[in-house]
């Protein structure tokens, strides 16, 4: 009696119970990017430590060639902090045909690629105009949400100009996701 | 029989399955800081409402002297954001020999302490350059991500002036950590 | 005998245990505003696609007129991205009586509504002052926390000026929450 | 425009309760503290406490026992109360705005009080 | 409590000099060091926060500098209009504290 009553209970949520702990889970940190030719129109993708200080893959999450590969499906939690710094960026000094000009900008976009598709698909994007007068300049664009990914998915980082990220510091610049 | 085909699996999974909703968890959010001396090249340590408002701490997550105490090891999901304003900041005017100035900045740094271990390790770093002209500036710092952590460490928050950040409203500047 | 040892010590976490990929969550993306009237000192808030291209709710988390309806009470992380566009806000230029401007700014509100709770809850505020001269600008705020909600509860995210949002593409302006 | 007005009786007898009010307009109430600071005549500035929109305050320990400061956030006004003056507490009261943390940049024209019976 | 104390009491300059006001704290303040500067008859104005930096609206004549106990404001060129009592304001410790006073006047 006792064993009926409890089999249909655990049944219904056995299946699907998993330890958190064996969960894939990543936090890669920034390296300094060596200079990479990039194809014209497209961000260059930025390329992490994944063991040494802070960084670590874990639970069959792996990092590969500037891909985190996604080893299981499900709904993930993916961020990434960019930090920029550059000089002086006189956006405002000199307009044509009394028109504003296009301001410089830096962008981050995480990027999903999925083998059986040709295009990869930008997740987050975040993009900021700079329009720092007189002094040199440093700013982080920061990123983060939940997607859908399938086994085998791939995600990098791109942005905007790879000689403005501010590589000094594992804490500063850094990539990471984790299955929910 | 049927038993016998249950105890393995069970066994499987059972160690290391916990209920969500006992996982050390808080979020801490801003009260004013009362002026106090730091040591000199030290980024000063913000203090935290962790009861009122929408301030919690809970299942052993514990807040003191400025400090989160993490219970338990694990992977943790740890964010703040800080609201800074200030008045203008005219870091555009004076070049000594053509060169631009040092700009004035504003930063944030998630620190963890570990009793064994001499020195602080910096989780996560925003920092930005401040070159407002003109007019009282205000703009917000938001930092996250997830971090292996050790039972007994200690989280703090960090930040480069201690007096240009908001304290007014408790959505504005927080902290807060969760075991993943 | 066996089942004696068992029994305590499933009693212990089975009640509270439940399967991750059950757990309400939802992404919602950016679609462009139609302009709407709203009270005077009081944000709009922002519609969102909930079903096409990255946007998803699952699980019982519903979305409807504006607002992500919460199934059941825990603790939910939310989050929200809101890029900003506008033209050159030359704040710095004009001065009354030697007074500098009020700024120009940006503000993003998390906010939740409890039907049994007259006065809406801020729960996040992310607020920059913009003064952007010589050039059209754009920049992206973010926000993300943890906090208890109840079953019952609506989200919603509103901004200081629905014209200024970037509403061009679903990995520029987004809004989310998970269960824990 | 921001803009402080300090209001109250310009002379208290000695062992009475000075009273102050200060109306604030032109900016929002509780995105700031605000503070009420004296200056005896022909001397320095002395820093007396201050109070959120919540009602949140910090005071001088030098006066914290003789010192209330109330808000009134539905007439975006705040008050000091200083009780048993004397007439060293002669001064000219300002009220003035905290931003951004433990600085006064906006300050009312001040109301000069004169203890003396 | 932190003394902050003002020297000299007293600056005759002229119109066009440079004037260079002292103020030193009885223990280290880091940068948080503000100046005021009133006119007769008026309430104090806040002129540099952060030992160094310029408050809103404030002319590029007006310098501060320094850090911990020693702290300097500096204005360029005096203006007419510069002549005024100069205050200095600690807020790296509660109570907040105010000097003195440093008088700036025609010579």
């Known amino acids: 009696l006792k064993g009926q009553e409890f089999a249909p209970s655990h049944q219904q949520v056995y299946a699907p119970l998993r330890a958190d702990g064996d969960k894939p889970r990543a936090h890669l940190t920034v390296v300094r990017q060596t200079p990479t030719q990039h194809f014209k129109n497209q961000f260059p993708a930025l390329h992490w430590e994944h063991e040494l200080g802070l960084a670590f893959t874990k639970n069959r999450m792996n990092y590969t060639n500037k891909f985190l590969l996604i080893p299981e499906s499900g709904d993930y939690f993916i961020y990434s902090q960019v930090t920029f710094r550059g000089m002086t960026s006189e956006c405002s000094e000199i307009r044509q045909a009394g028109r504003p000009n296009k301001p410089d900008s830096i962008t981050v976009v995480i990027t999903k690629v999925t083998d059986s598709y040709p295009e990869p698909t930008q997740l987050l994007m975040g993009t900021k105009s700079v329009c720092e007068v007189g002094s040199n300049w440093f700013q982080p664009i920061y990123l983060g949400a939940m997607f859908s990914l399938q086994e085998g998915d791939k995600l990098m980082v791109n942005v905007s100009d790879i000689s403005l990220v501010d590589y000094t510091k594992e804490d500063k610049t850094f990539f990471g996701a984790f299955l929910l | 029989l049927k038993g016998q085909e249950f105890a393995p699996s069970h066994q499987q999974v059972y160690a290391p399955l916990r209920a969500d909703g006992d996982k050390p968890r808080a979020h801490l959010t801003v009260v004013r800081q009362t002026p106090t001396q730091h040591f000199k090249n030290q980024f000063p340590a913000l203090h935290w409402e962790h009861e009122l408002g929408l301030a919690f701490t809970k299942n052993r997550m514990n807040y003191t002297n400025k400090f989160l105490l993490i219970p338990e090891s694990g992977d943790y999901f740890i964010y703040s954001q800080v609201t800074f304003r200030g008045m203008t900041s005219e870091c555009s005017e004076i070049r000594q020999a053509g060169r631009p100035n040092k700009p004035d900045s504003i930063t944030v740094v998630i620190t963890k302490v570990t009793d064994s271990y001499p020195e602080p390790t910096q989780l996560l770093m925003g920092t930005k350059s401040v070159c407002e002209v003109g007019s009282n500036w205000f703009q917000p710092i938001y930092l996250g991500a997830m971090f292996s952590l050790q039972e007994g460490d200690k989280l703090m928050v960090n930040v480069s002036d201690i007096s240009l950040v908001d304290y007014t409203k408790e959505d504005k500047t927080f902290f807060g950590a969760f075991l993943l | 005998l066996k089942g004696q040892e068992f029994a305590p010590s499933h009693q212990q976490v089975y009640a509270p245990l439940r399967a991750d990929g059950d757990k309400p969550r939802a992404h919602l993306t950016v679609v462009r505003q139609t302009p709407t009237q709203h009270f005077k000192n009081q944000f709009p808030a922002l519609h969102w696609e909930h079903e096409l291209g990255l946007a998803f709710t699952k699980n019982r988390m519903n979305y409807t007129n504006k607002f992500l309806l919460i199934p059941e009470s825990g603790d939910y992380f939310i989050y929200s991205q809101v890029t900003f566009r506008g033209m050159t806000s030359e704040c710095s230029e004009i001065r009354q009586a030697g007074r500098p401007n009020k700024p120009d700014s940006i503000t993003v509100v998390i906010t939740k509504v409890t039907d049994s709770y007259p006065e809406p809850t801020q729960l996040l505020m992310g607020t920059k002052s913009v003064c952007e001269v010589g050039s059209n600008w754009f920049q992206p705020i973010y926000l993300g926390a943890m906090f208890s909600l109840q079953e019952g509860d609506k989200l919603m995210v509103n901004v200081s000026d629905i014209s200024l949002v970037d509403y061009t593409k679903e990995d520029k302006t987004f809004f989310g929450a998970f269960l824990l | 425009e921001v803009q402080l007005q300090e209001s109250g009786p310009g002379l208290v007898k000695p062992s009475e309760t000075l009273s102050l009010t200060c109306a604030v307009s032109g900016v929002s109430y509780s995105d700031y503290h605000w503070a009420w600071i004296r200056q005896p005549p022909g001397k320095g500035l002395e820093w007396i406490g201050d109070i959120n929109h919540k009602g949140k305050t910090n005071y001088n320990p030098s006066l914290k026992s003789r010192v209330t400061i109330s808000v009134d956030t539905s007439k975006n006004q705040f008050s000091l109360k200083l009780s048993s003056v004397t007439a060293a507490d002669t001064a000219v009261y300002y009220c003035?705005?905290?931003?951004?943390?433990?600085?006064?940049?906006?300050w009312g024209q001040g109301t000069l009080v004169t203890v003396s019976s | 409590a932190i003394q902050m104390t003002q020297s000299p009491g007293t600056l005759s300059l002229s119109p066009g000099e440079r004037a260079t006001l002292s103020c030193r704290a009885s223990?280290?303040?880091?940068?948080?060091l503000a100046w005021y500067q009133q006119k007769p008859g008026q309430a104090p104005r806040l002129l540099i926060y952060?030992?160094?930096r310029r408050a809103t609206g404030i002319p590029a004549r007006f310098s501060g500098s320094g850090s911990g106990t020693d702290f300097t404001l500096t204005i360029s060129r005096l203006e007419p209009e510069d002549f005024a009592v100069y205050y200095c304001q600690q807020y790296a410790d509660s109570p907040l504290t105010f000097g003195q006073g440093t008088k700036v006047e025609i010579k």
């Open positions: 223990q280290s303040v880091s940068s948080h």
């Open positions: 952060g030992a160094s």
């Open positions: 003035a705005r905290d931003y951004p943390n433990f600085l006064f940049d906006y």
